[in-house]
């Protein structure tokens, strides 16, 4: 008789999850010499230990502490790029501008990017059928708690000028409920961070509006200013040209506004 299994509203654990995490860790530590000392088996043991045999709606940041500790790395604190609802462009940018880092350019972010995982209470099984959805089931699920934890630590580490890429095509360019709005903004350290510079990415070809005047951007400015951090904002009218100019800054067309 098959054992009753909780049905959650979200997709199940990504297939071959353990193998994927281990393989990503090995690849990352090979590419990044400063992380060669990391024992990927220990990293996987810590990752697994955070959610296996635990109720997937009862995960805490403390569950991830061993993983956070083992995966800690040196990222230049003044080269951090945050993003909200525009992951692909942010990643394309850091692939070109190699001295800047998104969370997914760090070991822990790289391990978990685009993956889903959860376990079941009191069994050592990984649930490949379904996992809790943040809205429909519970917020303290393994994936959400992981991203909240790593995002908080990433923001805490930032210093000097921190950049954030925002999606100008969305109704809420700055969304208080996003990871950026609910976690990262509130964990920037005013004693270390001088300025948050927002890059608002335009979607439409002919869109020449100043999206830095958007009410949600003004709301972001207000939150940041209240935290004694300066705020600045730039429109990126042509993201394609923006990336091209990052690749080839000497190009004559790159002196004009992008």
């Amino acid at each position: 008789v098959p054992r009753w299994r909780q049905q959650w509203s979200g997709p199940g654990t990504t297939k071959r999850f353990p193998e994927t995490v281990l393989a990503r860790c090995v690849k990352y530590t090979e590419i990044h010499p400063e992380m060669r000392h990391v024992d990927c088996q220990s990293v996987w043991d810590a990752f697994k230990g955070a959610f296996i045999s635990k109720h997937p709606c009862n995960i805490t940041e403390e569950d991830y502490q061993p993983l956070m500790k083992l995966g800690t790395q040196t990222v230049p604190c003044n080269k951090i790029l945050l993003w909200s609802r525009i992951k692909d462009l942010a990643h394309q940018f850091t692939q070109v501008q190699r001295d800047m880092f998104t969370l997914e350019d760090t070991l822990l972010g790289y391990l978990a990017d685009d993956l889903t995982w959860c376990g079941e209470f009191n069994t050592s099984k990984i649930n490949y059928q379904s996992c809790p959805d943040w809205r429909k089931d519970c917020s303290n699920n393994p994936v959400s708690v992981f991203w909240k934890t790593v995002s908080r630590r990433f923001a805490e580490a930032a210093c000097d000028v921190v950049h954030v890429m925002l999606n100008g095509s969305r109704s809420k360019i700055f969304d208080k409920n996003s990871t950026f709005g609910s976690v990262e903004v509130h964990n920037l350290q005013p004693e270390k961070v001088q300025t948050l510079e927002a890059w608002v990415i335009h979607g439409g070809r002919e869109d020449s509006r100043d999206l830095c005047q958007d009410p949600t951007i003004k709301e972001l400015e207000s939150i940041i200013s209240k935290r004694n951090i300066q705020f600045s904002c730039k429109n990126i009218y042509r993201p394609d040209k923006f990336l091209q100019c990052v690749k080839n800054p000497e190009d004559s067309s790159c002196t004009s506004e992008i």
């Epitope: 400063e34 992380m35 024992d39 230990g49 790395q73 040196t74 604190c77």
Partner: antibody
């Protein structure tokens, strides 16, 4: 080989502060946590806090929060532990150690701090 | 805080004896347990990390086992230099905590 060399013994008055140093060599200082542990005379081991020198991450034992500050100087591969508002119960040997797989693989020789009026 | 309880707190044994020290955590610590040896006036030395991994340079007569809440350090054949105090330590959650120690004395 990995070595952690600590500063010398200190005698301090109650209410004052002490700063113990821990100079690391034989490995990449910025890649490993440095842990601080103390041991009162005839007693067991007590974890105080740690630092990841490459990112400045620190974690402290709540018991010492507000009294202990752990810092690191990358240029000299040296970690520091400062304990303030000293009292007689703080008389102990203070150790630094390198973190490895959530344990501590190499230890300094220890620094005796005596708090006495 | 996670409490670490070692037993026994002291034991007397002879050279060549097999010695077992246990450590119990007040909650699940997975495999994040270290074992240390300390001699009077000296800094502790790591013997075992991650419950069962022998640290570099540690003699193979030392071994560790366990996961979850119950752990064991075994010395297969006690040598004169093994008379010391042994501590376990959990690394699962802050604050890291140590057992109270087990003193191994000569019978």
């Amino acid at each position: 080989q990995v070595q952690l060399v600590q500063s010398g013994a200190e005698v301090k008055k109650p209410g004052s502060s002490v700063k113990v140093s821990c100079k690391a060599s034989g490995y990449t200082f910025t890649n490993h946590w440095i842990e601080w542990v103390r041991q009162a005379p005839g007693q067991g081991l007590e974890w105080m806090g740690d630092i990841f020198p490459g990112g400045g991450y620190t974690d402290y034992n709540e018991k010492f929060k507000g009294r202990v500050t752990i810092t690191a100087d990358e240029s000299t591969s040296t970690a520091y532990m400062e304990l303030s508002s000293l009292r007689s119960e703080d008389t102990a040997v203070y150790y630094c150690a390198r973190g490895r797989d959530l344990a501590m693989d190499y230890w300094g020789q220890g620094t005796l701090v005596t708090v006495s009026s | 805080d996670i409490q670490m309880t070692q037993s026994p707190s002291s034991l007397s044994a002879s050279v060549g004896d097999r010695v077992t020290i246990t450590c119990r955590a007040s909650q699940n610590i997975n495999v994040w347990l270290g074992w240390y040896q300390q001699k009077p006036g000296k800094a502790p030395k790591l013997l075992i990390y991650k419950a069962s991994n022998l640290h570099t340079g540690v003699p193979s007569r030392f071994s560790g086992s366990g996961s979850g809440t119950d752990f064991t350090l075994t010395i297969s054949s006690l040598q004169p230099e093994d008379f010391a105090t042994y501590y376990c330590q959990q690394g699962q959650s802050y604050p890291y905590t140590f057992g109270q120690g087990t003193k191994v004395e000569i019978k």
